[in-house]
């Protein structure tokens, strides 16, 4: 017998959200991306697997692909050639680093209904794509290139001299993947699939990361990465162009580097095609506040690509790097020279330039105190694009079109009273020439995605509301949400506030600090969550505070750069800041104050409890960051210069945790790591650890064997139960 | 499967014309490079002509340079060649071959026998 | 234009036999070398291409190796229908230039 449910009121039907509910991902939303193939057109895997093509002209809808096909090779993927002859089907996916991953490839014939057979890919396949128009495939097999004019072809083999962890053709070495690029790839064919792209990367003198993976068996792998840490040898890239019609005539030709760039240490940052016969290349300084961007044409004669130095533009930042996280990238217009590209304007704020002769002549084509964030697509007589404007909250994000056929242009915010309560963070995907779009919002109430008209504007369809979920939180009590700001010092610290569901100001809560704080991030953004922190205010009413400080983005470069060349202090600082204005409303319980981030968080986190302050009770840090010399040349140098005595060593030394370690005496620290993290390494924690052993401080640690920066799977359980106990512990909250 | 059938070889007086030709199937002509190659009674293999998928760029051995002209029709799946001021020394078995990647010959007519001669 | 040498120019052998064809470019191509065999009447047939590369459908006792400009063809054991002649052909600068052909005859 069970004593029946008490109806008297909401309150007692609803219950607060378990630890399980967010291990179990019980509260996770969908979003609706569409796979375009042409203007009005779309790919789309429904439900049972189908591959489904979607007409939104004529309304209707057919099945491409069926189920049974995708499972008869364990698809987990696919992807249709432009002539809609052929789909590859994707399988055996092996992941490797953050973006890069392995997997075997069948090419099926669609007008047949059967494998192509003969002249087989060969597995595992680093990366493959088709061609944009027609069905020439270029893909990457044991760090070397190969085209196929036809699936049934033989491949032509473009390089030879690829080699593992030596020499990287058509992909990134792990920094560049990692740090500039942000893909698996690094080839890029022409608008019409006549010339091929690519980059190689040399990595022969890169120094090398070695770690124990260790498995199952009697003895440990060791897993060796060439891996430049801040001030190492970096790997040497070059660029090459081969025609894909007739691959051996010269074979590939390389992309000439600027010469401002070439005198020194320097980076290649995106390739973006014009047009079949016009490339624009970015290349970047080591030291990064030195970028150009250099336009390329097709010599015939020569067979031989020109980049004359009156199309090379430089993008140069006297007050930090150069670009945001990276460099933007330009998107050109249809006159196939002048380009839009988002960077600073004269008052310190990321806006959308265009560009038609020089970079000193430039349009500004949006301004104010706000950022221009991304631009989607510039059709003949319209630039989307998003930004943080709409009533001054850096952290939303809306789409607007600005009219570039008129004069003056006019803008109109797309999204902005859509839904407004529900939707303040979109982003955009479009067809051919925007001929329609999606809207993709991702809060901060339920996410929803909707099909729009690309001349009107006109909501057509929506193409998922997540009503599962919708229905799922009615019973939960969800925690309640405040994205405010505190003005300190003439530096405005947005935050926001994640409160207990019977939140009541006269009583005292513990409250837990989320950081990330690095470089040109965002913490405070109006998108919807159910995850551990939402759990932590929900079922252990805890406060739960995330604040953006000095070094974070889309609020100018004031506050930006502030950080540039002495990262660990202003970030810290401002965390500090915040706390002690969160104590000062009155609900927080100043005994019970605790702080942990993850990567540069756990970096952040760390130094925060070693602040002396006496503020937090206890922290963790999770794979964090614990001497820049011990990261990523490219990312760390971007912000930092160079670990040599005549640029930035002394910041080095006096930035890290273990010089901190005595300062750890009077909080409860938990340090956490995967042994096999492949970005921050082990080594960080070890030496973190080591030190604090040196100063004798006690303090809590847990590794994960085997498992990298994402510490996932049945980690994952295993790191949120610990951390939970870790806190309740802290907090005095009982089990 | 792969299919090149040639036609319109036979016997010409020196200086005189001929149109040879090339049916393709099996294969989406119009995606390859397509070529010609010849070989003299007794002799070696011989490359004569080739020209692009789309039929817009055309290379020329500089035995034939100015007197024989490629073409195709992408419409058709065919190719020619228009030989004209023919010589002695131009009797061959002409074939027709795809030219994969502008590089090697996959795949090969049966040859059509041209004989000049007076 | 670029010279292809061949040697032998004829070479005989029995069944069963390695069987090693030479062939030589006047400059570099790279891996841009192929290899025919043609028997009398018929028209070529492309064996291996890009160096080393078989053919589909083509037997594995055929086998190509080399890069630059130095290249070999290998039948590791001659069979009866492999009585033919063997040409190379390099691929470069949209030039195709052949060998003048290896004849192998019955020993």
């Known amino acids: 017998l069970r004593p029946s449910r008490v109806h008297n009121s909401e309150e007692n039907t609803m219950r607060a959200l378990t630890l399980k509910d967010i291990l179990n991902g019980t509260f996770s939303y969908k979003t609706f991306f569409p796979n375009w193939i042409s203007g009005q057109e779309y790919l789309h895997q429904s439900a049972d697997n189908n591959i489904v093509l979607y007409n939104i002209e004529t309304g209707q809808s057919y099945t491409i692909l069926s189920n049974r096909t995708m499972k008869s090779v364990n698809a987990s993927n696919y992807g249709l050639s432009p002539d809609r002859q052929f789909v590859y089907l994707e399988s055996d996916y092996s992941k490797l680093w953050r973006y890069s991953y392995t997997a075997t490839y069948y090419i099926y014939d669609l007008s047949n209904g059967e494998f192509v057979r003969g002249n087989e890919l060969p597995r595992p396949i680093q990366y493959l794509c088709w061609s944009p128009v027609g069905s020439k495939l270029a893909y990457v097999y044991q760090n070397n290139i190969y085209l196929k004019q036809r699936p049934g072809d033989p491949p032509f083999q473009i390089t030879f001299n690829g080699r593992e962890n030596k020499i990287f053709n058509g992909i990134p070495d792990w920094v560049y993947e990692e740090e500039m690029l942000a893909t698996k790839y690094a080839l890029w064919w022409s608008p019409n699939g006549k010339f091929l792209a690519y980059a190689e990367f040399n990595d022969t003198d890169i120094p090398v990361i070695a770690y124990s993976y260790y498995g199952d068996e009697q003895y440990p792998r060791t897993i060796n990465i060439p891996y430049p840490k801040a001030g190492a040898k970096n790997p040497v890239v070059r660029i090459f162009i081969i025609d894909t019609t007739y691959p051996a005539y010269v074979g590939p030709q390389e992309v000439p580097v600027p010469a401002m760039i070439a005198s020194s240490d320097y980076y290649f940052s995106w390739l973006t095609w014009v047009t079949d016969e016009r490339v624009c290349l970015q290349w970047l300084k080591r030291v990064q506040n030195v970028s150009v961007l250099s336009i390329c044409d097709f010599r015939e004669d020569w067979q031989t690509w020109d980049c004359p130095k009156t199309q090379e533009h430089i993008e140069e930042s006297r007050t930090g790097w150069a670009g945001g996280f990276f460099v933007s990238t330009p998107v050109f217009s249809y006159d196939a020279i002048s380009y839009y590209k988002i960077f600073s304007d004269k008052d310190g704020y990321k806006h959308i330039h265009y560009i038609k002769d020089t970079v000193e002549n430039a349009i500004q084509i949006t301004s104010g105190k706000w950022e221009a964030i991304n631009i989607f697509r510039v059709t003949q007589d319209s630039l989307f694009y998003s930004s943080n404007e709409f009533e001054e909250y850096p952290g939303r994000r809306n789409i607007y079109r600005i009219s570039i056929g008129s004069y003056p242009p006019s803008k109109k915010c797309v999204t902005c009273h859509l839904r407004k309560e529900r939707c303040q963070y979109y982003t955009a995907s479009f067809s051919d020439y925007a001929k329609y779009y999606a809207l993709v919002c991702y809060g901060p109430g339920i996410p929803i995605s909707t099909l729009h008209d690309g001349r009107t504007d006109q909501e057509i369809k929506i193409l998922e509301e997540n009503k599962e979920l919708e229905n799922a939180l009615k019973n939960i009590q969800l925690p309640k949400e405040e994205i405010k700001k505190l003005e300190v010092d003439e530096i405005t610290l947005w935050y926001k506030m994640i409160l207990p569901p019977q939140f009541d100001r006269s009583k005292k809560y513990p409250l837990l600090i989320q950081v990330y704080g690095g470089p040109c991030s965002q913490s405070v953004r109006s998108v919807f969550a159910v995850n551990w922190i939402s759990y932590l205010a929900s079922k252990e009413g805890m406060v739960i505070a995330l604040v953006d400080g000095r070094g974070t983005a889309f609020q100018g470069d004031k506050l930006l750069y502030a950080v540039y060349r002495k990262l660990g202090v202003y970030e810290v600082e401002d965390q500090i800041t915040a706390v002690r204005k969160f104590i000062e409303m009155g609900f927080i319980d100043e005994k019970r104050i605790a702080i942990w981030g993850w990567s540069y968080g756990g970096y952040v986190s760390s130094l925060a409890l070693a602040s002396g302050t006496g503020l937090f009770k206890c922290g963790i840090a999770v794979a964090p960051v614990s001497s820049w010399e011990y990261y990523a040349s490219v990312y760390t140098e971007r912000f930092m210069g160079l670990p040599t005595k005549d640029d930035n060593l002394e910041h080095y030394k006096n930035s890290t945790v273990m010089a901190r370690a005595e300062y750890f005496r009077n909080v409860d620290y938990l340090l956490i790591h995967g042994t096999a993290d492949d970005n921050v390494h082990f080594q960080n924690s070890a030496q973190i650890a080591k030190a604090l052993v040196n100063a004798q401080v006690d303090f809590q640690a847990m590794w994960y064997s085997d498992q990298n920066h994402g510490l996932s799977g049945l980690s994952t359980n295993h790191l949120y139960t610990h951390m939970t106990h870790f806190l309740k512990q802290c907090f005095s909250l009982s089990d | 499967e792969v299919q090149l059938v040639e036609s319109g070889g036979g016997l010409v007086q020196p200086g005189g014309s001929l149109r040879l030709s090339c049916a393709a199937s099996?294969?989406?002509?119009?995606?390859?490079?397509m070529s010609w190659v010849r070989q003299a009674p007794g002799k070696g293999l011989e490359w004569v002509s080739w020209?692009?998928?789309?039929?817009?760029?055309?290379g020329y051995a500089d035995s034939v340079k100015g007197r024989f002209t490629i073409s195709r029709d992408n419409s058709k799946n065919t190719l020619y060649l228009q030989m004209n001021s023919l010589r002695a020394e131009d009797t061959a078995v002409y074939y027709c071959?795809?030219?994969?990647?502008?590089?090697?010959?996959?795949?090969w007519g049966q040859g059509t026998l041209v004989t000049v001669s007076s | 234009d670029i010279q292809m040498t061949q040697s032998p120019s004829s070479l005989s052998a029995s069944v069963g036999d390695r069987v090693t064809i030479t062939c030589r470019a006047s400059?570099?191509?790279?891996?841009?070398l192929n290899w025919y065999q043609q028997k009398p009447g018929k028209a070529p047939k492309l064996l291996i291409y890009?160096?080393?590369s078989l053919q589909s459908g083509v037997p594995s006792r055929f086998s190509g190796s080399g890069s630059g400009t130095d290249f070999t063809l290998t039948i590791s054991s001659l069979q009866p229908e492999d009585f033919a002649t063997y040409y190379c052909?390099?691929?470069?600068?949209?030039?195709?230039?052949f060998g003048q052909g290896t004849k192998v005859e019955i020993k």
């Open positions: 071959a795809r030219l994969q990647y502008g590089t090697w010959f996959d795949y």
């Open positions: 400059q570099s191509i790279s891996s841009y």
């Open positions: 890009a160096a080393s």
């Open positions: 099996g294969f989406t002509f119009r995606g390859y490079i």
């Open positions: 052909q390099q691929g470069t600068l949209l030039l195709p230039t």
């Open positions: 020209i692009s998928p789309e039929g817009s760029r055309t």
